[in-house]
């Protein structure tokens, strides 16, 4: 799988999007999990509503929320009040029975300062010999959410390494 890098600023909110084929994954619940090491399972953080038809309802686990646009085919995860320890490798998953398909691998980076965001020209992308075959960067700065406010999607640059 390609890996997408999402960068956010400590104390602010970050929105992660995972697009998927809505027909292929019709009727399937989704999940957001964290890979805590090179080996071992992906640790579930939050999953969509138990009733697939209600997947559009936002579900929270602590400061992490998930919502699914099943018609448009976009799973959205919001990390509120981002902290350094939220950084890590995550997966968006499509669930079927006890199995899970990976929709997207996501690397979340938490920066100390908005000025630490690099310009597109400064970003580095891994080559084929690196840990991931390909990288796709969503370079985002989000603002803090007011209570009950729906976060706006991050401004992003899309980069592909071939």
């Amino acid at each position: 799988h390609n890996t997408t890098v999402f960068q956010g600023v400590a104390g602010q909110s970050l929105q992660v999007s995972c697009p998927y084929d809505s027909m292929k994954h019709w009727g399937r619940r989704k999940a957001w999990c964290r890979q805590l090491g090179e080996k071992g399972p992906c640790q579930r953080v939050v999953s969509t509503h138990n009733l697939w038809l209600l997947s559009f309802l936002r579900r929270w686990n602590g400061s992490t929320a998930i919502t699914d646009d099943t018609l448009g085919g976009t799973l959205t995860i919001t990390l509120r009040n981002l902290q350094p320890h939220d950084a890590g490798l995550y997966q968006c998953q499509s669930l079927h029975g006890s199995e899970a398909d990976t929709l997207r691998k996501v690397l979340v980076e938490v920066l100390a300062d908005p000025l630490d965001h690099r310009d597109a020209g400064d970003l580095w992308f891994p080559g084929e010999s690196e840990s991931f075959e390909d990288a796709h960067v969503e370079h985002s700065i989000s603002r803090s959410l007011l209570e009950g406010e729906i976060p706006f999607p991050p401004t992003s640059h899309h980069h592909h390494h071939h």
Epitope: Q7, E38, H85, L89
Partner: antibody, heavy 121, light 107 residues
């Protein structure tokens, strides 16, 4: 076995710059964050900043912004820290410390042996 | 910045004695705290992370605990190799900060 081998002690003149290295072995270099920490003589530790070797993204302690620059060379699994405009206040031992998997969510499990920097005319 | 107030700054104790060191966080750090040991040659080793999880290879006489904003490192029965400097580290938020250190000396 995880090892972080830091470069040797250096004596530099005030106003000069110094670039120290931390060569990592025993693990996949790009999978783990690398932190840098300062310890002035007889004092406690201060976190300087962190770099994600996979993307090159950095975060700095505001106190060291403009003083320290963190970089990596993935081909040699080496992290670097450059300190500029050196003064006697920069005389210290500097440590590299590996974080956890694409994060620092469990702190710094592995430490280098430290590089002594002495600033003197 | 989060201040980590470590006490005592120095401690004299005898072999076999039980000792406790404490770090108080000025803000909530939710257990994102580790304890480090620094030997006289400068070598630093992590003993405990996530407030109470013992690192592999660390003797069981070391333990970590939390009570509100107070975090403690306890050595149940001191051995000669335990005499060193100890630091707490919070990695909950930027900038990461260390306690002032405790010098543990032989009485």
């Amino acid at each position: 076995e995880v090892q972080l081998q830091e470069s040797g002690p250096v004596l530099v003149k005030p106003g000069a710059s110094v670039k120290m290295s931390c060569k990592a072995s025993g693990y996949t270099f790009t999978d783990y964050y690398m932190n840098w920490v300062k310890q002035s003589h007889g004092k406690s530790l201060e976190w300087i900043g962190v770099i994600n070797p996979y993307t090159g993204a950095t975060s700095y302690n505001q106190k060291f912004k403009g003083k320290a620059t963190l970089t990596v060379d993935k081909s040699s699994s080496t992290a670097y820290m450059e300190l500029n405009s050196l003064t006697s206040e920069d005389s210290a031992v500097y440590y590299c410390a590996r974080g956890t998997y694409y994060s620092n969510y469990e702190g710094f499990p592995y430490w280098g042996q430290g590089t002594l920097v002495t600033v003197s005319a | 910045d989060i201040q980590m107030t470590q006490s005592p700054s120095s401690l004299s104790a005898s072999l076999g004695e039980r000792v406790s060191l404490t770090c108080r966080a000025s803000q909530e750090i939710s257990g994102y705290l580790s304890w480090l040991q620094q030997k006289p040659d400068g070598t630093i080793k992590r003993l405990i992370y996530a407030a109470s999880t013992l690192d592999s290879g660390v003797p069981k006489r070391f333990s970590g605990s939390r009570s509100g904003s107070d975090y403690s490192l306890t050595i149940s029965s001191l051995e000669s190799e335990d005499f060193a400097d100890y630091y707490c580290l919070q990695y909950a938020s930027y900038p990461y900060t260390f306690g002032g250190g405790t010098k543990l000396e032989i009485k």
